[in-house]
Interface confidence: low
């Protein structure tokens, strides 16, 4: 029996509305407009499976639902990569695949999805509540990351009936279903806009979740403008860390991570702008990454009450901009 957890990675925020028009007339068109605008926004899905016959064997599958070309995929466990997570595998379309124990087999399934088999025994083996994260770097969307773990109820030792949910079916159903709804919605929206084109259009309230013009890193693919800041839906569960993570190292997470001020989420990317004030470049658990904020010191969009910002232990590497010539 396989148990699996499919994690929806992104949740588009709802822009506020302001204007003299009645809500009944406007809510649907503007919700549809939001859907149409964000329809092209990439998403990352993560699926974690555990084989009942091999309790220490996990299969992680990740996919990127976007139009851009993928330049790199990083799979980690124990939390987001660079935020307490341990790198398990790196898949590069041209350079190849690198994997680290207990990863046994990492491979590309399609041009936009990968799978990773973990095997371990004793200290190096994952356990049921380990969090697995996948980060996709793509052009022009930037970096997107989502995490997933087996739900507590998915203990393969339980005599629950098997749940062979075909991933292909789920993916296609989701893609086709959403695409169909969006297509219909967009057509309907155009219809409504044509009917109401003589009316004054309501102003969109400046949303606090709208990022400034993105600034790409010197070494990263430039990121296309995003309509909104998307926060992945994922639970960081590090209560079961690999026993090999015993010595003090950059991943040891101080308890004050959770109270990190939101303006510390990103680091300015100038050659020396961050020299005296180390702030993580990819510290936040936010899907859109490659340079969301126009200037250092600018307060980034409000990330919501449940979002924890994770400093990047790759201080040495995460923040360099043009200093590291690639």
């Amino acid at each position: 029996m396989r148990t699996e957890a499919q994690v929806p990675a992104l949740q588009p925020p709802e822009p506020g509305l302001e204007g003299a028009m009645g809500h009944r007339t406007l809510v649907l068109p503007w919700v549809l407009l939001t859907l149409c605008v964000t329809a092209g926004t990439p998403e990352v899905w993560v699926q974690v499976r555990m084989e009942a016959t091999e309790l220490s064997s996990f299969t992680i599958r990740c996919g990127f639902l976007g139009s851009g070309s993928i330049s790199l995929v990083t799979v980690s466990w124990g939390g987001p990569n660079g935020a307490g997570g341990t790198t398990l595998a790196v898949l590069h379309p041209e350079r190849g695949i690198r994997q680290w124990a207990p990863a046994r087999q990492a491979r590309w399934e399609t041009q936009s999805s990968i799978s990773l088999i973990l095997e371990g025994s004793g200290a190096s083996s994952p356990c049921a509540n380990t969090t697995f994260c996948c980060k996709f770097a793509s052009f022009p969307e930037g970096s997107w990351e989502a995490c997933g773990s087996l739900p507590p109820s998915s203990d393969p030792g339980l005599s629950a009936p098997p749940t062979p949910a075909p991933i292909l079916r789920a993916d296609l159903a989701g893609i086709l279903g959403v695409s169909g709804v969006l297509l219909f919605g967009c057509v309907y929206l155009l219809h409504l806009l044509r009917r109401h084109k003589h009316r004054p259009a309501p102003r969109l309230q400046p949303s606090r979740t709208s990022p400034q013009a993105p600034r790409a890193r010197a070494w990263a693919p430039s990121q296309a403008s995003q309509a909104a800041l998307h926060v992945p839906y994922a639970t960081i569960n590090t209560s079961c860390r690999p026993a090999t993570l015993d010595t003090a190292h950059p991943h040891g997470g101080p308890s004050w991570w959770a109270s990190l001020p939101t303006h510390a989420a990103h680091r300015p990317q100038g050659p020396a702008a961050w020299a005296s004030t180390p702030i993580p470049a990819r510290g936040s658990f936010v899907s859109v990454e490659n340079g969301l904020y126009a200037q250092a010191g600018e307060r980034p969009p409000h990330t919501g009450p449940g979002l924890t910002l994770f400093p990047d232990p790759r201080g040495p590497r995460a923040m360099e901009g043009p200093l590291g010539v690639r």
């Epitope: 790199l72 994997q99 680290w100 090999t244 003090a248 190292h249 993580p280 040495p316």
Partner: antibody, heavy 127, light 112 residues
Framework: EVQLVQSGAEVKKPGASVKVSCKVS????????MHWVRQAPGKGLEWMGG????????IYAQKFQGRVTMTEDTSTDTAYMELSSLRSEDTAVYYC????????????????????WGQGTTVTVSS | DVVMTQSPLSLPVTLGQPASISCRSS???????????LDWYLQKPGQSPQLLIY???NRASGVPDRFSGSGSGTDFTLKISRVEAEDVGVYYC?????????FGQGTKVEIK
């Protein structure tokens, strides 16, 4: 246990190129992040560049940009460092270095953890 | 680049006695995650460098406990509680906070 064995000493003329090899044993090259560090006679250590596993690319110190190329042959688990347009000040011992897979680098997040070093390759640039 | 300055450049020591080497960086090496990105290496005569201490105060695998690292921000110290004959060589500090990582000039430890 990771072990690194480097190629033998080289004598080159100014303007020429040198290619130093570093053979990995104990692990496959694809599991490691290889760095190259050099040491001029009587001088200190100088990092030249290395592989960044997250970005899947090799990063070079700006000082060597355009002159150094670090490559890998995964079929033989051998890393190479080629330095072109040699000058007399490039006379040095060149080391490859990586992590032993039991340090923090093996867990991601710390790519300059170099606890396994090759024996060094002496490159002499002289006319 | 971050400039690393070591002192003293030469340190004559007595066997069995403690020794201390200082390393100062031009920029703080304390990262927001609470770790200091400073390593210590020892290069024994005629050998390749070997890692002693990483992230400021963590002994690398196989390193005797007579070696200890301390300090934070820009000032760091490597201490040898009781110097042994095999400890002679050149000690280097290295910052790993910024690309490129940079080394100090080295401190040569020799027996008096």
């Amino acid at each position: 246990e990771v072990q690194l064995v480097q190629s033998g000493a080289e004598v080159k003329k100014p303007g020429a190129s040198v290619k130093v090899s570093c053979k990995v044993s104990g692990y496959t090259l694809t599991e490691l992040s290889m760095h190259w560090v050099r040491q001029a006679p009587g001088k200190g250590l100088e990092w030249m560049g290395g592989f960044d596993p997250e970005d899947g690319e090799t990063i070079y110190a700006q000082k060597f940009q355009g002159r150094v190329t670090m490559t890998e042959d995964t079929s033989t688990d051998t890393a190479y460092m080629e330095l072109s347009s040699l000058r007399s000040e490039d006379t040095a011992v060149y080391y490859c270095a990586t992590d032993s897979r039991d340090g923090p680098a093996a867990r991601g997040g710390y790519y300059y953890y170099m606890d396994v070093w090759g024996q060094g390759t002496t490159v002499t640039v002289s006319s | 680049d971050v400039v690393m300055t070591q002192s003293p450049l030469s340190l004559p020591v007595t066997l069995g006695q403690p020794a201390s080497i200082s390393c100062r960086s031009s920029q703080s090496l304390l990262y927001i995650n609470g770790y200091n990105y400073l390593d210590w290496y020892l290069q024994k005569p005629g050998q390749s460098p070997q890692l002693l201490i990483y992230l400021g105060s963590n002994r690398a695998s196989g390193v005797p406990d007579r070696f200890s690292g301390s300090g934070s921000g820009t000032d760091f110290t490597l201490k040898i509680s009781r110097v042994e004959a095999e400890d002679v060589g050149v000690y280097y500090c290295m910052q790993a906070l910024q690309t490129p990582p940079t080394f100090g000039q080295g401190t040569k430890v020799e027996i008096k």
